[in-house]
Amino acid sequence: KVFGRCELAAAMKRHGLDNYRGYSLGNWVCAAKFESNFNTQATNRNTDGSTDYGILQINSRWWCNDGRTPGSRNLCNIPCSALLSSDITASVNCAKKIVSDGNGMNAWVAWRNRCKGTDVQAWIRGCRL
């Protein structure tokens, strides 16, 4: 599923991401935009043999199990396929674990490079939330 901007903002808010660990909703929507272009089925294979999955491009070396990444820790205790669902529950729950790991949203390179220090509230402007 490819979410609309406000549709995703609403879904993320329902799942408790607004101000989760101090990150406003706009940060999460911005991260999703530049990680996956709001596409829940986005996958990207990395040259280290790991793969990034879903709307927040969660990595199989650390957070989920895809059965093909050597040394996978699966710290979110989920199959990576769950991160590709149109229901973003699994992605959100795993993202909450990642962001709680000590480095916050810096774990997402796209957020660091494209969202951090910008007017992220623009990503939810005009949305009925």
């Epitope: 990395n46 070396r61 000590g102 480095n103 810096n106 774990a107 390179v109």
Partner: nanobody
Framework: QVQLVESGGGLVQAGGSLRLSCAAS?????????IGWFRQAPGKEREFVAA????????TYDDSVKGRFTISRDNAKNTVYLQMNSLKPEDTAVYYC?????????WGQGTQVTVSS
């Protein structure tokens, strides 16, 4: 541009130890990136060995080295280490350091480890 330089390889007897180092230059070592080691034995494909991410000290290892190898990093020195104990002849390979930044990876030139029986 990241440049990675490995050192510490050499010839060692089975059961011995080595510590590999990988120094990064050209870019500040981000504490958020995955940093680790792969290896390639003659005539074989490059295979994952170990990796680490974040200051929380999360690490992961291939089953073949678990309990024998330890990965660590020193962010202040822009260096990642691979402590290799109880080495076996099958650990003989060129060991490569890598840093993953987003969907881009940077690789070193490798250091040869030879374990004799």
């Amino acid at each position: 541009q990241v440049q990675l330089v490995e050192s510490g390889g050499g010839l060692v007897q089975a059961g011995g130890s080595l510590r590999l180092s990988c120094a990064a230059s050209g870019r500040i070592f981000s504490i958020y990136d995955t940093i680790g080691w792969f290896r390639q034995a003659p005539g074989k494909e490059r295979e994952f060995v170990a990796a680490t991410i974040t200051t929380a000290g999360i690490t992961t290892y291939d089953d073949s080295v678990k309990g024998r190898f330890t990965i660590s990093r020193d962010n202040a020195k822009n260096t990642v280490y691979l402590q290799m104990n109880s080495l076996k002849p099958e650990d003989t390979a060129v060991y490569y350091c890598y840093v993953r930044v987003g969907r881009g990876d940077y690789w070193g030139q490798g250091t040869q480890v030879t374990v004799s029986s």
